[in-house]
């Protein structure tokens, strides 16, 4: 719990509790925005991106995305708060220990999406389709 | 009982350095992910810097990157932050604070905190 000490500011959002009243601290992610990447049909990638950064709000969790248009594939690690939008997305897995990609609708290139809320957890992008979600098994495992 | 004890605050010129010590007792702290954090006044907490149990990995907010190290001797059970190239900005009450193998939860121990004051 926070103690008096610690003054609480208005519209705090540095400090955020857990329904047991205890101090949420913040994620570790990796964050080096967008990279050109040699992730290609593979059913896992590394990230290769050398920074963890803390994330600035302990709400927000590890993102990342992978595109591929007839020029280039990039990957983009970030962290970002899920209550907000995601290039246009909603992170609808964000609470997954594990960074699961899927596949968005964005016209002009392929686009997977993926968001996860353990430590580094977007330095492995998962495309695989043992992962998939829509299995209610598989749903208890992940988030075992 | 917890106790995380921090020391080496003060006043200090723009671009001086200062170096902080947190004593910790009452648990396990070389298991332990141990952090820095700040407050300035008026606003909220700032998440400044963490160190794994072990030392081996260290992690730190971008508006400190290259000017602050973080350490710990286990052997001490102190944690260090080294505070180079200070600006009037990082005037604020430096925390420290452990985060324990259960998670993300937790900070419930906190010291009193070192006022730290960079002005001319």
């Known amino acids: 719990t926070i103690p008096p000490h610690v003054q609480k500011s208005v519209n705090n959002d540095m400090i955020v509790t857990d329904n047991n009243g205890a101090v949420k601290f913040p994620q570790l992610c990796k964050f080096c925005d967008v990279r050109f990447s040699t992730c290609d049909n593979q059913k896992s990638c590394m990230s290769n991106c050398s920074i963890t950064s803390i994330c600035e709000k302990p709400q927000e969790v590890c993102v990342a995305v992978w595109r591929k248009n007839d020029e280039n594939i990039t990957l983009e690690t970030v962290c970002h708060d899920p209550k907000l939008p995601y290039h246009d997305f909603i992170l609808e897995d964000a609470a997954s220990p594990k960074c699961i990609m899927k596949e968005k609708k964005k016209p002009g290139e392929t686009f997977f999406m993926c968001s996860c809320s353990s430590d580094e957890c977007n330095d492995n992008i998962i495309f695989s389709e043992e992962y998939n979600t829509s299995n209610p098994d598989l749903l208890l495992v992940i988030f075992q | 009982e917890v106790q995380l004890l921090e020391s080496g605050g003060g006043l200090v010129q723009p671009g001086g350095s200062l170096r902080l010590s947190c004593a910790a007792s009452?648990?396990?702290?070389?298991?332990?992910r141990m952090w820095w954090v700040r407050q300035a006044p008026g606003k909220g907490l700032e998440w400044v810097s963490?160190?794994?149990?072990?030392?081996?990995?260290?992690y730190y907010a971008d508006s400190v990157k290259g000017r602050f190290t973080i350490s710990r001797d286990n052997s001490k059970n102190t944690l260090y932050l080294q505070m180079n190239s200070l600006r009037a900005e990082d005037t604020a009450v430096y925390y420290c604070?452990?985060?324990?193998?259960?998670?993300?939860?937790?900070?419930?121990?906190w010291g009193q905190g070192t006022l730290v004051t960079v002005s001319s």
């Open positions: 604070a452990n985060q324990n193998k259960s998670g993300r939860s937790g900070f419930d121990y």
């Open positions: 963490a160190i794994e149990s072990g030392g081996h990995r260290t």
């Open positions: 009452g648990f396990t702290f070389d298991q332990d």
